[in-house]
Interface confidence: low
């Protein structure tokens, strides 16, 4: 039985040109995390594999940095980065857990939500 739950940063916003940390946390399970995938809609952004470490998709290498932890840092944000992001935890023996984050990239100088996840 899958007992775990994914906690995420939820709905967050950030300024155009800035950076943001996407964070998910898997709790309430003793399952072994074997891999975490980060996806944007249907595109794979990055993989963190327990044996092989991080792999960033070539098309995102300039703007995506691994970490902190199993999170993902998006840099040089554009309005086109607005949308849904998914952290997909592959675990044994539980199976797959998925968390959803909605990021809104704002033109204005004030990003109201998720400020505590901002990077200077």
């Amino acid at each position: 039985m899958m007992t775990g739950t994914i906690e995420t940063t939820g709905n967050i916003s950030a300024e155009k040109g800035g950076s943001i940390i996407l964070q998910c946390h898997l709790s309430s399970t003793t399952a072994q995390v074997t891999q975490v995938n980060w996806e944007q809609q249907d595109q794979l952004l990055a993989i963190c594999n327990a044996d092989l470490g991080w792999h960033i998709s070539p098309s995102f290498k300039d703007r995506v940095a691994p970490g902190p932890g199993l999170g993902l840092t998006l840099q040089s944000l554009t309005v086109n980065d607005t949308g849904e992001y998914f952290c997909i935890y592959h675990t044994y023996p539980d199976g797959t857990y998925t968390g959803r984050i909605f990021l809104e990239v704002l033109e204005s100088s004030v990003a109201e939500h998720g400020a505590r996840f901002q990077i200077p």
């Epitope: 072994q32 995390v33 327990a50 470490g53």
Partner: antibody, heavy 119, light 107 residues
Framework: QVQLQQPGPELVKPGASVKISCKAS????????MNWVKQSNGKSLEWIGV????????NYNQKFKGKATLTVDQSSSTAYMQLNSLTSEDSAVYFC????????????WGQGTTLTVSS | DIVMTQSPASLSASVGETVTITCRAS??????LAWYQQKQGKSPQLLVF???TLTEGVPSRFSGSGSGTQFSLKINSLQPEDFGSYYC?????????FGGGTKLEIK
């Protein structure tokens, strides 16, 4: 405290095989990767490969594919590395090293096993 | 494979001096870098991971810095026990590779 216990020096003949053990204690064996690292002649360090004791998944440096085989015995918390078709080039110190998941840096090391290949 | 280039290969310094060892990665490894110290005839010991995080028990005179492709390990006020060899290693993704090492000797 964390300990990785390796055997003493090994002297083997060219063409033979050797299996080096690494007995882990002081932590949960399946919670960390186990890596093997080669150091020739006091020179730099070369990563050979890694095995996940929980799943048995292994991964090798291309250079050591076919040369090294990594296995684990969960019941005894022991990792093994077998080296085959030995030549003088394989003479070196071999370390086992505990690797942290999601960032394979090596936070605990065995004391090393000196392998000498000579007829 | 990512190539790690370490410099200098050897370094002579006196107790009390400050030294800096550098490490360059052939491609962007973000902050996925570790530093190790190795004494003659002993196994390496982890000093720093994630480029700047000191391992528990490592004296604060050691500090790591850098990101991307350029990294350094600084040792303030050298102590007799600091002499030995130092290696950098990237932990960005397999295969994990080490720098060629820096031998730190007493002047």
């Amino acid at each position: 405290q964390v300990q990785l216990q390796q055997p003493g020096p090994e002297l083997v003949k060219p063409g033979a095989s050797v299996k080096i053990s690494c007995k882990a204690s002081g932590y949960s064996f399946t919670d960390y990767n186990m890596n093997w690292v080669k150091q020739s002649n006091g020179k730099s360090l070369e990563w050979i490969g890694v095995i996940n004791p929980n799943s048995g998944t292994d991964n090798y440096n291309q250079k050591f594919k076919g040369k090294a085989t990594l296995t684990v015995d969960q019941s005894s918390s022991t990792a093994y590395m077998q080296l085959n078709s030995l030549t003088s080039e394989d003479s070196a110190v071999y370390f086992c090293a505990r690797g942290v998941y999601f960032g394979n840096y090596f936070d605990s090391w065995g004391q090393g096993t000196t392998l000498t290949v000579s007829s | 494979d990512i190539v790690m280039t370490q410099s200098p290969a050897s370094l002579s310094a006196s107790v009390g001096e400050t030294v800096t060892i550098t490490c360059r990665a052939s491609e962007n490894i973000y902050s996925s870098l570790a530093w190790y110290q190795q004494k003659q005839g002993k196994s390496p010991q982890l000093l720093v991971f994630n480029a700047k995080t000191l391992t528990e028990g490592v004296p604060s005179r050691f500090s790591g810095s850098g990101s991307g492709t350029q990294f350094s390990l600084k040792i303030n006020s050298l102590q007799p026990e600091d002499f030995g060899s130092y290696y950098c290693q990237h932990h960005y993704g397999a295969p994990w590779t080490f720098g060629g090492g820096t031998k730190l000797e007493i002047k």
